[in-house]
């Protein structure tokens, strides 16, 4: 015997209180598949969350984050604070990248500068808190007599220590 509820389309639920007829989902709820016995509560995009897509009777709302924050987690379940380039988010808030590390985005962690010498190359452009070093040609590739493009080691920035 076919389940009468299987005829209920998305946007409705099979109402046991009314002889299993298909009733529309009430306001603030949805059903994304047919044959549902209840409708799910719509997600609320409030506070730090903004509505990217309104809830409908057949699909949940979708949220993103208010300016200064970015989405984390499946379906933007959390909003994390943006930091400036050259910083990373810690439990104490945004902190500058330590010397020898950089972050070129408003999110994520500070990463170590590329070690050019591991590839047998020299440093063409020094790294900063916001940018990785740029590696140049290996010293052997330089023509004889050409001046080295390796700049002097950068001075230690005050308040920063190697990780």
């Amino acid at each position: 015997l076919q389940d009468p509820c299987s005829n209920c389309p998305a946007g409705t639920f099979c109402d046991n209180n009314r002889n299993q007829i298909c009733s529309p989902c009430p306001p603030n709820s949805f059903s994304s598949a047919g044959g549902q016995r209840t409708c799910d509560i719509c997600r609320q995009c409030k506070g730090v969350f903004r509505t990217r897509k309104e809830c409908s009777s057949t699909s949940n709302a979708e949220c993103d984050c208010t300016p200064g924050f970015h989405c984390l987690g499946a379906g933007c379940s959390m909003c994390e604070q943006d930091c400036k380039q050259g910083q990373e988010l810690t439990k104490k808030g945004c902190k500058d990248c330590c010397f020898g590390t950089f972050n070129d985005q408003k999110r994520g962690i500070c990463r170590p500068w590329t070690n050019c010498s591991l590839d047998g190359k020299s440093v063409l452009v020094n790294g900063t808190k916001e940018r990785d070093v740029v590696c140049g040609p290996s010293p052997a590739d330089l023509s004889p007599g050409a001046s080295s493009v390796t700049p002097p080691a950068p001075a230690r920035e005050p308040g920063h220590s190697p990780q």
């Epitope: 009430p26 603030n28 997600r43 409030k46 506070g47 730090v48 969350f49 959390m78 909003c79």
Partner: antibody, heavy 121, light 111 residues
């Protein structure tokens, strides 16, 4: 099970600053809103303001110029500071968890037991 | 003065059904779900109904909520003496970007 506990002085002099801390135990302070709500004697519940775990804040417009809410996720605590208090700020102050937004929909679902703050000289 | 309007008092006898109303505006109840709380003297409010008509686990089905337009109501059937408490409605207010509350309804169980 998450529990909230308010702490701070029960008596504050007029024009001074009211400072309260809420300690969250039995769960993480991450991914929720953390709220201060007050209830003057025999009066209505009033939202003071809230902070999201990652630092977003929103304050009641009537108190905005005097209130600061901060959070320390490493200590699982959040705090309320209310400046230039008057007798009208005498109330029971509740800290509470709010899961509204994100994927939550309960709203303010866990409350501290409340702490009475009297403003008097 | 509260943003949501509730009657200050309501009463009923044991076994009766009582309804408490809550009136708001388009920026709160009209556009957002309603929560209901009960508060016993000297204690914190406890969530009774969320999202208009949903009961958290442990709340008996004697308590039900509904919403229409910019008004909401809480119904308590089979009234019991332990239901005597203050009942508050709450809704998110888009203009204030936060929760607003009613001033509470004191429910008295007679007899």
């Amino acid at each position: 099970q998450v529990q909230l506990q308010e702490s701070g002085p029960g008596l504050v002099k007029p024009s001074e600053t009211l400072s309260l801390t809420c300690t969250v135990s039995g769960g993480s302070i991450s991914s929720y809103y953390w709220t201060w709500i007050r209830q003057p004697p025999g009066k209505c519940l009033e939202l003071v303001g809230y902070i999201y775990y990652s630092g977003y804040t929103s304050y009641n417009p009537s108190l905005k110029s005097r209130v600061t809410i901060s959070i320390d996720t490493s200590k699982n605590q959040f705090s309320l500071q209310l400046n230039s208090v008057t007798a009208a700020d005498t109330a029971v102050y509740f800290c509470a968890r709010d899961d509204y937004g994100g994927n939550g929909y309960y709203g303010v679902d866990v409350w501290g037991q409340g702490t009475t703050v009297t403003v008097s000289s | 003065q509260s943003v949501l309007t509730q009657p200050p008092s309501a009463s009923g006898t044991p076994g009766q059904r009582v309804t408490i109303s809550c009136s708001g505006s388009s920026s709160n109840i009209g556009n957002n779900p309603v929560n209901w709380y009960r508060q016993l003297p000297g204690t914190a409010p406890k969530l009774l109904i969320y999202s208009n008509n949903q009961r958290p686990s442990g709340v008996p089905d004697r308590f039900s909520g509904s919403k229409s337009g910019t008004s909401a109501s809480l119904a308590i059937s089979g009234l019991q003496s332990e239901d005597e408490a203050d009942y508050y409605c709450a809704a998110w207010d888009d203009s204030l970007n936060g929760w607003v509350f009613g001033c509470g309804t004191k429910l008295t169980v007679l007899g």
